[in-house]
């Protein structure tokens, strides 16, 4: 995993825009792990970053991700009166100028370098789940979540009519 110490230096100053150009409501620097306590790590390979899901060795430092929270109106057409309410959306940045992106065509999760304003592919609807977990749903593809597949992050379609191992899309956030 690459050194992540630069995150602390830019947590406040850098993150000052959202979907609509306003500031995030709050930010949170945290390590990201799966429901089964595997760590999400980021490595620089051939001038691009790769994302891994792996068991860390004892005392190995966890990579940190800056989560920037935004409030957003629910995009659903189910009601035009706002009764679906506001949601929380999030962007995830493990190092300066890089953000997690949903690649819906490849069903993959990638780290992209980009400038503000961030594209919609960098925004995820944050779901508050039980067991101190969260899930990340693609803003650009409702019903598709960040999940774990073959020791990598991938996009997983969640259909409420199907049985799905929910653990695949559950993540833990920790300050340590």
């Amino acid at each position: 995993a690459f050194g992540i110490s630069g995150v602390q230096k830019y947590t406040r100053a850098l993150h000052d825009s959202s979907i609509t150009g306003i500031s995030p409501i709050t930010e949170y620097l945290a390590s990201l792990s799966t429901y089964n306590d595997q760590s999400i790590t980021f490595a620089l390979e051939d001038e691009s970053y790769e994302i891994y899901v792996e068991d860390l060795k004892k005392d190995e430092k966890k990579d940190k991700v800056l989560l920037s929270y935004y409030e957003s109106q629910h995009p659903s057409n189910e009601s035009g009166d706002g009764v679906d309410g506001k949601m929380l959306m999030v962007t995830l940045s493990p190092t300066k100028d890089f953000w997690l992106h949903a690649n819906n065509k490849e069903h993959s999760v990638e780290l992209h370098k980009c400038e503000k304003p961030l594209p919609d592919q960098a925004f995820f609807v944050l779901h508050n789940m039980h067991s101190n977990c969260v899930s990340f749903e693609c803003k650009t593809d409702p019903g598709v979540f960040i999940g774990v597949k073959d020791n990598h992050l991938a996009l997983i379609k969640v259909d409420s009519s199907e049985n799905l191992c929910t653990e695949n899309i559950l993540f833990k956030l920790s300050e340590t």
């Epitope: 009601s79 929380l88 508050n128």
Partner: antibody, heavy 121, light 111 residues
């Protein structure tokens, strides 16, 4: 129009049972966590029970005061959530509200009008 | 269980004046870098209505005169300029841990 309509309330004797129903309309019911919240006459709000979605294995959670006596369930084909109440006590007398959590499960943002349950001999 | 305590129990404020309601949790309701604290308004004979979620974000369609602040264990709901239609009981609620618990309520009246 997004709507929750409760039914099944009424007068019941201590130790008796009652099943409350809540019919949902105007939204995709299967996408939302559902709750029951009650309010005793002249008192405050008390959260009772919650049921999640199919991909959460329809997990359920209860307030300690009703655990083992009340059961929440849902039928997505009927857009309905239920509260089965057994071994009812006088202190269960309240208006029972059916409530829907918002998309993402951060807060309750749709409420029914409530149905009154009176437990008395 | 997390115990939520509101103060005062009741409050009489003149029209156009500021109303402030406090809510204290028996332990921190912070998680994921946010405060899991919601505020609801309930008018007589009606179900509650969401005003504020995650301590300071306004619910949809909520007038700008309602604002929330705080983190950890101490929170405040402020009505910047009380209107006649704001007469109601106001509840804080924590949604960090099950069971989700409400404060006992604060009744706001016109002075």
């Amino acid at each position: 129009e997004v709507q929750l309509v409760e039914s099944g309330g009424g007068l019941v004797q201590p130790g008796g049972s009652l099943r409350l129903s809540c019919a949902a309309s105007g939204f995709t019911f299967s996408n939302y966590w559902m709750n029951w919240v009650r309010q005793a006459p002249g008192k405050g709000l008390e959260w009772m029970a919650e049921i999640t979605l199919k991909f959460n294995d329809y997990s359920t959670h209860y307030a300690e005061s009703v655990k083992g006596r009340f059961t929440i369930s849902r039928d997505n084909s009927k857009n309905t959530v239920y509260l089965q109440m057994n071994s009812l006590r006088a202190e269960d007398t309240a208006v029972y509200y059916c409530a829907r959590r918002n998309y993402g499960n951060w807060y309750i943002n749709v409420w029914g009008q409530g149905t009154l349950v009176t437990v008395s001999s | 269980d997390i115990v939520m305590t509101q103060s005062p129990d009741s409050l009489a404020v003149s029209l156009g004046e500021r109303a402030t309601i406090n809510c204290r949790a028996s332990e921190s309701v912070d998680k994921f870098g946010m405060s899991f604290l919601n505020w609801y308004q309930q008018k007589p004979g009606q179900p509650p209505k969401l005003l504020i979620f995650v301590a300071s974000s306004q619910g949809s369609g909520v007038p700008d005169r309602f604002s929330g602040s705080g983190s950890g264990t101490d929170f405040t709901l402020t009505i910047s300029s009380l209107q006649a239609e704001d007469v109601a009981v106001y509840y804080c609620q924590q949604s960090k841990d099950i069971p989700y618990t409400f404060g006992q309520g604060t009744k706001v009246e016109i002075k």
